[in-house]
Interface confidence: medium
């Protein structure tokens, strides 16, 4: 649903997006994710800031929390006990890395209206949650791991050893929380919260970054983080669980590591509970290719977890990594031993596979020349799952269901003709046993929540349509935008391009590369945005396009692992390659060509605009990686191998952007990093900057104090604003 | 065992309101979330359905008669009704009301029927 | 709206004979299919769902097979009461929808 187009008698009352409209999210969207509680009722936060519990079946709606409540304690979040008897309330949020931060909590009692006293908890707490059935809390506090049998109960402390940046009981360090876990949590209850298993994390060996913190003090603050650069000392992980009945009876028990993963330095991957009584872990070794899944059981004469081989499956890339960005996660049946699971299938495509006994014996489940993405949910009856096969667009998502529990068996798309011009691009959030489900379009349309039945998959209401946004947008030119493909030595180069409003064929625009380009990683999607691009378009005349080069994603590993163990060559050939096409098309001024990226992308516009081709004017890198042995073990090593003699160190050394100052001489460079990036660290603009002074390049930058790698709030405003002069400038445009 | 039955005017003039009504026994019709339908067959011709509705309120009509149909329900009569506006003699048909049973992935057929009741349009 | 399309519209057949009706979909359905049996002055009846499962109490002579966008309703062995009227209908997408149905008369 993009406002349609008007005619030309209708064009003077519309108007073009402005770079306030941008800063100012005027046209930002909602979206609309149930938080479920049961196979048909979930709780929502109206729009006056009550928390409201809507049951479906029969319509009604009641509100179990105050806005009045929430207000007393500066509550931000909430979440409700399974035996809804208590509500725990946050409240002084803080934030600390992507996911992670801390906050107090008020643990309220919804029977008879009045907080908890007694016992209440300590603050900052780093991580607290419910047990899945029952109230039952278990909390991180100054990284040990503390558990209640009721709110008001005094603790049990079930680690003792915790200290901060070197032992992490429950909650990930650094790398493992960005680059392994994607969470802020390290700890996971069993289904009926008998047991709870955690990661312990040793960081101890681990070698720190250390940065300054300007503040407003006499002395800038040092922040010391252990960071286990590619090549370095990792963190040792230890997987316990303790039985949450009798914590005091036993205490935790270790899960042994499978032998062929203890033999090297490893990772833990993820954990899955299974039953009360078994669960799934997975493992990694240091050299990304090798994951195991490794399914344990409770051994009650022991008081034990036992780990049988028979219960091991080994997952092996021969040709790049295991997985896509992460090892896939496992989806265990209802007879608790056979699974579902995504990965690679003998031609190289990402799918569903079901393994019952061993991965050798995998049925597969979905097949063909695209990919299956993520998988919602298995019921008895019917598989949920995500994919790209409609239309053969990778760069959209619909919602299929697999029956498993009749024959034969039936495939159906639930979303492919829904609102099919609005919405090409899906996620979704289910009800327990799929009773009810909640579809998220993305777009490309204007976005929009719709709730559905779980056995007939209609539409039964619409939870959020966007209709101030449809109605804001209704006045403006928006660009125009088309997702085409450019077929080029048998490699598919998918791409977005996004153009003026009133875009003619046979006038000649300025044209700005947008890259990210890292492996596994998707740009071309068909999703709703209005973003500093589209004003670029909208308002500035430039052509704008995306590609999806070799590394990126959901195209099948042929084009995924072509970057293996040699980041920073295809990537920027690729976007090279895609420009000179783009001036094949006749309306791009050649002499007026732009490249910038963020990150990873920061990385690849560097290379691109050092790559002695001539085709870009200028460019803009913000907080680019510069050298691959300054980021992180985790996710280098994935695609990069090590940085040692006998292992990779040479590619590490010929792909940094600093061995190509030389080339940026004959570019308008704009480098850009916040000085308190945690994640790719200051130091990588610094070397590059220093590389630049010592060949003599001239070239412009702009550091955020204090900021990091997301570059938030007034320094958001400042970095567009500037880049936008920076383009303006380069493309000979007036202000 | 469940058992639905329509009622209505078997004649409406053109331009009018057909109402009819579908009473449920044999079973709660709030208890579960099954949805109620309304199908139709004008005479010698095929099934068309017009509309459903869930005991919440929920409703989804066909998008060829959507401007023209409500379905509402009754959950203390054990009821639910169709309205359809602006009647023609196209709308001349046997109305039935109906009710699924689901099966298998998603998938799902009319279990139960109404015995159907004639409406005629004409002045 | 996924259209459907039955043939023939109507059929002449006897006692004992082999009858096959075919139901096309204007999209792929998967194996979201089901027939109906009709007869004069009755509400329709359940004999085929997911395109090949036999209702229960369905006697088994009447079979159902295909996906995709091909079905077809098979009747072994044509008994007196088994001339009706036979509807397909797809459960795949909203709105269901029902082909225009099939007659067996008797020749």
């Known amino acids: 649903l993009r406002p349609s187009r008007v005619h030309n008698s209708e064009e003077n009352t519309m108007r073009a997006l402005t770079l306030k409209d941008i800063l100012n999210g005027t046209f930002s969207y909602k979206t609309f994710f149930p938080n479920w509680i049961s196979g048909q009722e979930y709780l929502h936060q109206s729009a006056d800031n009550n928390i409201v519990l809507y049951n479906i079946e029969t319509g009604q709606s009641y509100t179990i929390l105050s806005n009045r409540t929430m207000k007393s304690v500066n509550a931000s979040n909430y979440g409700l006990s399974p035996d809804r008897q208590f509500v725990y309330l946050e409240s002084d949020y803080s934030k600390l890395w992507r996911y992670s931060y801390t906050a107090t909590y008020y643990i309220y009692d919804l029977s008879n209206g009045e907080f908890v006293r007694g016992n209440e908890l300590p603050r900052p707490i780093q991580y607290l949650c419910w047990s899945p059935v029952g109230s039952k809390l278990a909390y991180v506090y100054q990284n040990n791991i503390y558990l209640k049998q009721r709110p008001g109960d005094p603790p049990f402390q079930i680690t003792f050893n915790g200290r901060e940046n070197k032992i992490f009981n429950g909650i990930p360090d650094w790398v493992y929380e960005e680059e392994m876990l994607a969470t802020k949590y390290a700890l996971w209850w069993s289904p009926n919260g008998k047991f709870l298993a955690y990661a312990e994390f040793n960081d101890t060996d681990i070698p720190v970054i250390a940065y300054s913190y300007y503040g407003d003090e006499q002395y800038p603050r040092t922040i010391n983080i252990p960071y286990p650069k590619a090549g370095a000392k990792n963190p040792v992980v230890r997987i316990f669980i303790i039985d949450t009945t009798y914590p005091a009876y036993v205490g935790p028990q270790e899960v042994p590591v499978p032998a062929m993963i203890a033999s090297s330095d490893y990772y833990f991957s993820w954990l899955t509970w299974v039953t009360d009584e078994r669960v799934c872990l997975q493992w990694l070794k240091r050299v990304q290719n090798v994951s195991v899944l490794s399914i344990c059981d409770f051994r009650e004469d022991w008081q034990t977890w036992d780990c049988p081989k028979t219960q091991e499956h080994i997952e092996e890339s021969r040709t790049g990594w295991a997985g896509g960005f992460f090892v896939s996660t496992p989806v265990f049946s209802y007879d608790a031993i056979s699974y579902y699971k995504i990965f690679s299938d003998k031609d190289g495509y990402k799918h569903i596979h079901y393994i019952k006994d061993t991965v050798e014996n995998a049925i597969q489940i979905t097949s063909g020349k695209w990919e299956a993405i993520n998988i919602f949910r298995v019921t008895q009856d019917s598989l949920f799952y995500s994919s790209n096969e409609f239309e053969e667009y990778p760069g959209r998502r619909n919602i299929y269901r697999i029956s498993i529990g009749s024959y034969p068996p039936s495939k159906k798309c639930v979303t492919c003709h829904l609102r099919k011009e609005r919405c090409q691009y899906y996620t979704a959030s289910f009800s327990d046993y799929a009773k009810y489900y909640a579809l998220v379009c993305y777009g490309p349309g204007i976005p929009i929540s719709t709730l559905h039945d779980g056995r007939t998959d209609q539409e039964i209401k619409i939870l959020e349509e966007n209709k101030e946004l449809e109605n804001a947008l209704k006045n403006i030119q928006l660009p125009k935008e088309e997702i085409k493909k450019l077929e080029v030595d048998e490699i598919t180069l998918w791409y977005k391009m996004i153009l003026p409003p009133q875009f003619d064929r046979s006038k000649k625009y300025p044209l700005l590369i947008q890259v990210y380009g890292g492996p596994c990683s998707q740009s071309v999607r068909s999703v709703f945005a209005v973003n500093w691009i589209s004003y670029l378009a909208s308002k500035e005349g430039m052509v704008i396009a995306l590609v999806d080069g070799r590394g990126t994603a959901f195209q099948g590993d042929k084009l995924l692992y072509a970057v293996y163990r040699k980041l920073g060559v295809y990537e920027v050939e690729d976007q090279i390659t895609a420009v000179r096409k783009f001036i094949e098309m006749g309306f791009i001024d050649e002499k007026r060509i732009a490249i910038w990226g963020w990150s990873y992308g920061g990385y690849v516009s560097s290379l691109a605009l050092a790559s002695g081709t001539g085709l870009f004017k200028c460019g803009i890198a913000v907080a680019p990686v510069s050298s691959w042995e300054y980021y992180a073990s985790v996710y280098t090593e994935r695609f990069m191998g090590l940085p040692t003699k006998d292992d990779n160190l040479e590619h590490y050394k010929n792909s940094t952007v600093m061995a190509r100052a030389e080339y940026f001489r004959n570019v308008d460079y704009l480098l850009i990093h916040g000085t308190a990036d945690d994640n790719v660290h200051f130091q990588n603009s610094a070397q590059i900057a220093k590389a630049l002074v010592n060949a003599q390049v001239d070239f412009q930058a702009m550091w955020y104090s204090d900021q990091n790698h997301g570059l938030s709030g007034l320094s958001t405003n400042h970095l567009y604003t500037h880049m936008t002069h920076f383009l303006k400038q380069c493309f000979s445009l007036s202000d | 065992q469940l058992q639905l039955q329509e009622s209505g005017p078997g004649l409406v003039k053109p331009s009018e309101t057909l109402s009819l009504t579908c009473t449920v026994s044999g079973g709660s019709i709030s208890s579960s979330s099954y949805f109620w339908a309304w199908i139709r067959q004008p005479p010698g011709k095929g099934l068309e359905f017009i509309g459903n509705?869930?005991?919440?309120?929920?409703?989804y009509y066909n998008p060829s008669l959507k401007s023209r149909v409500t379905i509402s329900v009754d959950t203390s009569k054990n009821q639910f009704s169709l309205k359809l506006s602006s009647v023609t003699a196209a709308d001349t048909a046997v109305y039935y009301c109906?009710?699924?049973?689901?099966?298998?992935?998603?998938?799902?057929?009319?279990?139960?029927w109404g015995q159907g009741t004639l409406v005629t349009v004409s002045s | 709206d996924i259209q459907m399309t039955q043939s023939p519209s109507s059929l002449s057949a006897s006692v004992g004979d082999r009858v096959t009706i075919t139901c096309r979909a204007s999209?792929?359905?998967?194996?979201?299919l089901n027939w109906y049996q009709q007869k004069p002055g009755k509400a329709p009846k359940l004999l085929i769902y997911a395109a090949s499962s036999l209702q229960s109490g369905v006697p088994s002579r009447f079979s159902g097979s295909g996906s995709g966008t091909d079905f077809t309703l098979t009747i072994s062995s044509l008994q007196p009461e088994d001339f009706a009227t036979y509807y397909c209908?797809?459960?795949?997408?909203?709105?269901?929808?029902f082909g225009q149905g099939t007659k067996v008369e008797i020749k």
């Open positions: 999209q792929s359905i998967s194996s979201y």
């Open positions: 209908q797809q459960s795949y997408s909203t709105p269901p929808t």
């Open positions: 109906a009710r699924p049973s689901y099966y298998g992935s998603g998938n799902y057929y009319f279990a139960f």
């Open positions: 509705i869930y005991y919440s309120g929920s409703t």
